[in-house]
């Protein structure tokens, strides 16, 4: 049975050309995390593997800094990069769990950051 | 230039343990990640597991209770032990490199593949 | 464990004429696809990293597309050394798996 829970840190907006950060955290669960996949739609922006480090797709290189931690540095935000990204945690034994952030960039400087939330867990499935 | 180069017998009995090395030269072991790869006759390639530049190994959960990686950095070589082996392991045994911070998890140098038959 | 599904099974091609082979995911692995290219006797040499990237020194005759459960190799121009298998593999999750090969013969 999946008992964790992903808290990430929500609703988020940041100016264009700033950075953000996108941070995920796996909690109430004793799984051992083997890969952490951070995605936007259904393309790659990074995977951080247990065993092997950071691997920052090349569509991305230029502007995606690994960490800190688990979670993902996004630079020199475009109007574009407003979306939907995903934290795909795959664990031992449990399988796989989901966390959804949505970015916001905006041309002003009211930008700021949403109240962390917390998302039920689910198994994830494209 | 990079080469690797698999070696081991190219027959073993059933029940017996299945034992390949790996050398490889032009390059330190001390990076990147290392690959087992196996193709059985007439059958698609199968991932086997790899051995990190730390040591630290993965195996494919359906071989995993059989196999085991290690590696001999002063000698610049990992092998491949699978034990209990039955005809199913027959197949062509590949090790390959990868490099995880560039290219994920696409291997781009192969060995030329060394064939094992299973037979008594 | 992700299953790749490879079409066609083989594909005979006219010298200069151009090839697609499909790859499909059994589920979403966003952009983590190789492509190999195994020539008759010899092992398979990579292609195509994060599904559309050229590995150094591979003619730009081959291209690779494709993000979620749908990938596509394509050859604009086959060349009679271009014969052999090609696999599809993914590297979303562990294990990482292969699809089953499509035979490229040149007619």
């Known amino acids: 049975m999946m008992t964790g829970t992903i808290e990430t840190t929500g609703n988020i907006s940041a100016e264009k050309g700033g950075s953000i950060i996108l941070q995920c955290h796996l909690s109430s669960t004793t799984a051992q995390v083997t890969q952490v996949n951070w995605e936007q739609q259904d393309q790659l922006l990074a995977i951080c593997n247990a065993d092997l480090g950071w691997h920052i797709s090349p569509s991305f290189k230029d502007r995606v800094a690994p960490g800190p931690g688990l979670g993902l540095t996004l630079q020199s935000l475009t109007v574009n990069d407003t979306g939907e990204y995903f934290c795909i945690y795959h664990t031992y034994p449990d399988g796989t769990y989901t966390g959804r952030i949505f970015l916001e960039v905006l041309e002003s400087s009211v930008a700021e950051h949403g109240a962390r939330f917390q998302i039920p867990h689910h198994h994830h499935h494209h | 230039e990079v080469q690797l180069q698999e070696s081991g017998p190219g027959l073993v009995k059933p029940s017996e343990t299945l034992s390949l090395t790996c050398a490889v030269s032009?390059?330190?072991?001390?990076?990147?990640?290392w690959n087992w790869i196996r193709q059985p006759p007439g059958k698609k390639l199968e991932y086997i597991g790899y051995?990190?530049?730390?040591?630290?190994?993965y195996y494919n959960p359906s071989l995993k209770s059989r196999v085991t990686i290690s590696r001999d950095t002063s000698k610049n070589q990992f092998s491949l032990k699978l034990s209990s082996v039955t005809a199913a392991d027959t197949a062509v045994y590949y090790c390959a490199r990868g490099d995880y911070s560039n290219y994920g998890g696409a291997m781009y140098d192969w060995g030329q593949g060394t064939t094992v038959t299973v037979s008594s | 464990d992700i299953v790749m599904t490879q079409t066609p099974l083989s594909l005979s091609v006219t010298p200069g004429q151009p090839a697609s082979i499909s790859c499909r995911a059994s589920q979403g692995v966003s952009t983590t696809i190789a492509w190999y290219q195994q020539k008759p006797g010899q092992s398979p040499k990579l292609l195509i990293y994060s599904a559309s990237y050229r590995y150094t020194g591979v003619p730009d005759r081959f291209s690779g597309s494709g993000s979620g459960t749908d990938f596509t190799l394509k050859i604009s121009r086959v060349e009679a050394e271009d014969v052999g298998v090609y696999y599809c593999q993914q590297y979303y999750s562990s294990p990482f798996t292969f699809g089953g090969g499509t035979k490229v013969e040149i007619k």
């Open positions: 032009g390059y330190s072991m001390t990076s990147d990640y």
């Open positions: 051995i990190s530049y730390s040591g630290r190994t």
